[in-house]
Interface confidence: low
């Protein structure tokens, strides 16, 4: 069964970093791109960036450039999203979502990881 | 960046009635070579991740009931729920994937 399972909720202090994992199963990850999208309470979905799971090339939205790092471990079939210099506005549910070249839509999503930034 | 605008913000419709949600992009999402519009529609219920309904503007994802349909091309797109069911109460998002990704602001559909 194709699925993405994310790590659990996190509570972080402002200025700290958080690293969320997304474990893939049921498909060959090298054939896909993994995107990260977040949703702050009551807000619209916001695209963070993607990683090519085959060669690890990444692209980030300009808003997150310099603060976000998306990586992958093919042996563990897992993608990671690390966000640094956290501030209260980063409190959100972070989702990973699968996409494939030539299709350009997310057919499988992780369940979401709530990251709360609070002093 | 491509800006996506959805309207209305919320929509109250009676069960069995038609719901129409609009989405406008700041530039054309039509790829002239492939003939595809890179626009998708997602449904999101509270506490759940979004679920793919429609991709390439008008292709229904597998398992999605045929009361959901997508139309439009270029910059103007529509999601239609022909006969609203109780389980359709949710927030609906359009997303462009012509260049990178941008989400619309969402349309909340509730029962009148």
């Amino acid at each position: 069964q194709v699925q993405l399972v994310q790590s659990g909720a996190e509570v972080k202090k402002p200025g700290a970093s958080v690293k969320v994992s997304c474990k893939a199963s049921g498909f060959n990850i090298k054939d896909y791109y993994m995107h990260w999208v977040r949703q702050a309470p009551g807000q619209r979905l916001e695209w963070i960036g993607w990683i090519d799971l085959e060669n690890a090339n990444t692209v980030y939205d300009a808003k997150f450039q310099g603060r976000v790092t998306i990586t992958r471990d093919t042996s563990a079939s897992t993608a990671y999203m690390e966000l640094s210099s956290l501030r209260s506005e980063d409190t959100a549910v972070y989702y990973c979502a699968r996409d494939a070249y030539g299709r350009y839509f997310y057919d499988v999503w992780g369940q979401g990881t709530l990251v709360t930034v609070s002093s | 960046d491509i800006v996506m605008s959805q309207s209305p913000d919320s929509l109250a419709v009676s069960l069995g009635e038609r719901a129409t949600i609009n989405c406008k992009s700041s530039q054309s999402l039509l790829n002239a070579r492939t003939g595809k519009n890179y626009l998708a529609w997602y449904q999101q219920k509270p506490g759940q991740p979004p679920k793919l309904l429609i991709y390439w503007a008008s292709t229904r994802s597998s398992g999605v009931p045929d009361r959901f349909s997508g139309s439009g091309s270029g910059t103007d797109f529509t999601l239609t729920i022909s006969s609203l069911q109780a389980e359709d109460v949710a927030v609906y998002y359009c997303v462009q994937s012509y260049f990178r990704r941008t989400f619309g602001g969402g349309t909340k559909v509730e029962i009148k």
């Epitope: 090298k30 054939d31 791109y33 993607w50 090519d52 085959e54 060669n55 090339n57 692209v59 996409d99 494939a100 070249y101 030539g102 350009y104 | 999402l29 039509l30 790829n31 070579r33 492939t34 595809k36 890179y38 994937s97 012509y98 260049f99 990178r100 990704r101």
Partner: antibody, heavy 127, light 107 residues
């Protein structure tokens, strides 16, 4: 990791055509685009065109429009570049590379960079 | 088409020195659309930097890219013997174009 292996060197007469192949291995062929870039002796790099195999559509640089044909065969994971009406100025090393310009509407996956590259195929046009 | 002008044409430096290569576009280029390549004699180009500043997989951190609009820079913080090569910048617009290259040679 994707590897691109090109066909061997060719010597051609002016006015003839040449067809260079580029075989992909180690990845899903249909999940990326292939571009062709050439480099004349001692010169810089020149983009000729590209193709997305799953769409079957090719796009060409204006300079080569009408003379170049880029195709792909998904069954053999191979892309081809055919250049016709050859002249001496077409003597160059022809490279295939993964990637293509984003004007395919490629969701931002092809931001114009090319990686990896084939080893290159020297085409000599001489009478 | 967008013309990319690289300078200098040749850069003579010693190992351990800093190399700064410039790439100027004839019109504004989105930083998403700028890449740098390294090419050694008899070899295919190798991607170093994409999106103006993102290092490709496996590229040492002595290579860095910066810039926006019409002016972009590739910096090699401390030249290693294997860095002596020709470097090309490339933009993607309607048609991708490459700069004329900068040859980095040993002084």
């Amino acid at each position: 990791q994707v590897q691109l292996v090109q066909s061997g060197a060719e010597v051609k007469k002016p006015g003839s055509s040449v067809k260079v192949s580029c075989k992909a291995s180690g990845g899903t062929f249909s999940s990326y685009a292939i571009s062709w870039v050439r480099q004349a002796p001692g010169q810089g790099l020149e983009w000729m065109g590209g193709i997305i195999p799953i769409f079957g559509t090719a796009n060409y640089a204006q300079k080569f429009q009408g003379r170049v044909t880029i195709t792909a065969d998904e069954s053999t994971s191979t892309a081809y570049m055919e250049l016709s009406s050859l002249r001496s100025e077409d003597t160059a090393v022809y490279y295939c590379a993964r990637g293509a310009p984003n004007y395919y509407g490629s969701g931002g996956y092809d931001d114009g960079w090319f990686d990896p590259w084939g080893q290159g195929t020297l085409v000599t046009v001489s009478s | 088409e967008i013309v990319l002008t690289q300078s200098p044409g040749t850069l003579s430096l010693s190992p351990g020195e800093r190399a700064t290569l410039s790439c100027r576009a004839s019109q504004s280029v989105s930083s998403s659309y700028l890449a740098w390549y390294q090419q050694k004699p008899g070899q295919a180009p190798r991607l170093l930097i994409y999106g103006a500043s993102s290092r490709a997989t496996g590229i040492p951190d002595r290579f860095s890219g910066s810039g926006s609009g019409t002016d972009f820079t590739l910096t090699i913080s401390r030249l290693e013997p294997e860095d002596f090569a020709v470097y090309y910048c490339q933009q993607f617009g309607r048609d991708p174009t490459f700069g004329g290259g900068t040859k980095v040679e040993i002084k």
